[in-house]
Amino acid sequence: KKVVLGKKGDTVELTCTASQKKSIQFHWKNSNQIKILGNQGSFLTKGPSKLNDRADSRRSLWDQGNFPLIIKNLKIEDSDTYICEVEDQKEEVQLLVFGL
């Protein structure tokens, strides 16, 4: 599993890539299987996670088969394993947030 480091207060971008270079359905979950973010057509959908208004993606990348999860204003408690589900595959990224 990929490990990403982030600093408290910063923004981090977790990557998720599909083999198809086109916009398809994806969603990100945390280790508790709570949905964070996904898509319906050209639109974002958000789940009930604590990240909610700090979570985003980049629609301009979707049609290239890239479905990033952007987390803004990182908090220590955001440290977790994040799972991207796309094309019946799962990609796991471990995020470690450190303070100064």
Partner: antibody, heavy 121, light 108 residues
């Protein structure tokens, strides 16, 4: 020029269904979403949902799920919005609007003139 | 869903004056996902601004948008007679898309 042309006004009885059409011209119909937005007299705008003319994929707000069907006919560049189980509160002007995804931005840049639907017994 | 609240409901101003319209989201949204529309009586809405601050094609420079987080503003620097209308903000941060209740700019 780019335009969206609606079907004519409709008067329906409560419980009936209405199907509104929106014919696109001046651009490639399958390259942009069609959104549906309604407006009751003297009220604000209410987004209902969208159809992607290329894939046929649709989505609607929870408020209308089970009551609204959004379809398209690519051969005649026309989108349709059908609303069933009509009630008096559905009396409104129904607009179609072209949805543009430009980079990370999404906006509705071209609107039809709207179809007035009146629900009355 | 995100609730968009616009204020004031009505703004009474004279031609040439500056108009400042406010739009508040019930939760923080990215400025990427905020648009403004103008609607005149008997007409369909017209796109003015997208991405919080980018003017749509053909929109005069007197219209400008700003803001971030939960607070967004549409400013009309010098009102022209054709600017008296209702203005709506709209978010597409996530589904469902939602509009504000509108601000009517009327002639004083």
């Amino acid at each position: 020029q780019v335009q969206l042309v609606h079907s004519g006004a409709e008067v329906k009885k409560p419980g009936a269904s209405v199907k509104v059409s929106c014919k696109a011209s001046g651009y490639t119909f399958t390259s942009y979403d069609i959104n549906w937005v309604r407006q009751a007299t003297g009220q604000g705008l209410e987004w209902m949902g969208w159809v992607n003319p290329n894939s046929g994929n649709t989505g609607s707000t929870q408020k209308f799920q089970g009551r609204v069907t959004m379809t398209r006919n690519t051969s005649i560049s026309t989108a349709y919005m059908e609303l069933s189980s009509l009630r008096s509160e559905d009396t409104a002007v129904y607009y179609c609007a072209r949805g543009v995804l430009k980079g990370d931005y999404y906006y509705m840049d071209v609107w039809g003139k709207g179809t007035t639907v009146t629900v009355s017994s | 869903e995100i609730v968009m609240t616009q204020s004031p409901a009505t703004l009474s101003l004279s031609p040439g004056e500056r108009a400042t319209l406010s739009c508040r989201a019930s939760q923080s949204i990215s400025s990427t996902y905020l648009s403004w529309y103008q609607q005149k009586p008997g007409q369909a809405p017209r796109l003015l601004i997208y991405g919080s601050s980018t003017r749509a094609t053909g929109i005069p420079a007197r219209f400008s948008g700003s803001g971030s987080g939960t607070d967004f503003t549409l400013t009309i620097s010098s009102l022209q007679p054709e600017d008296f209308a209702v203005y709506y903000c709209q978010q597409d941060d996530h589904l469902p898309l939602t509009f504000g209740g509108g601000t009517k700019v009327e002639i004083k």
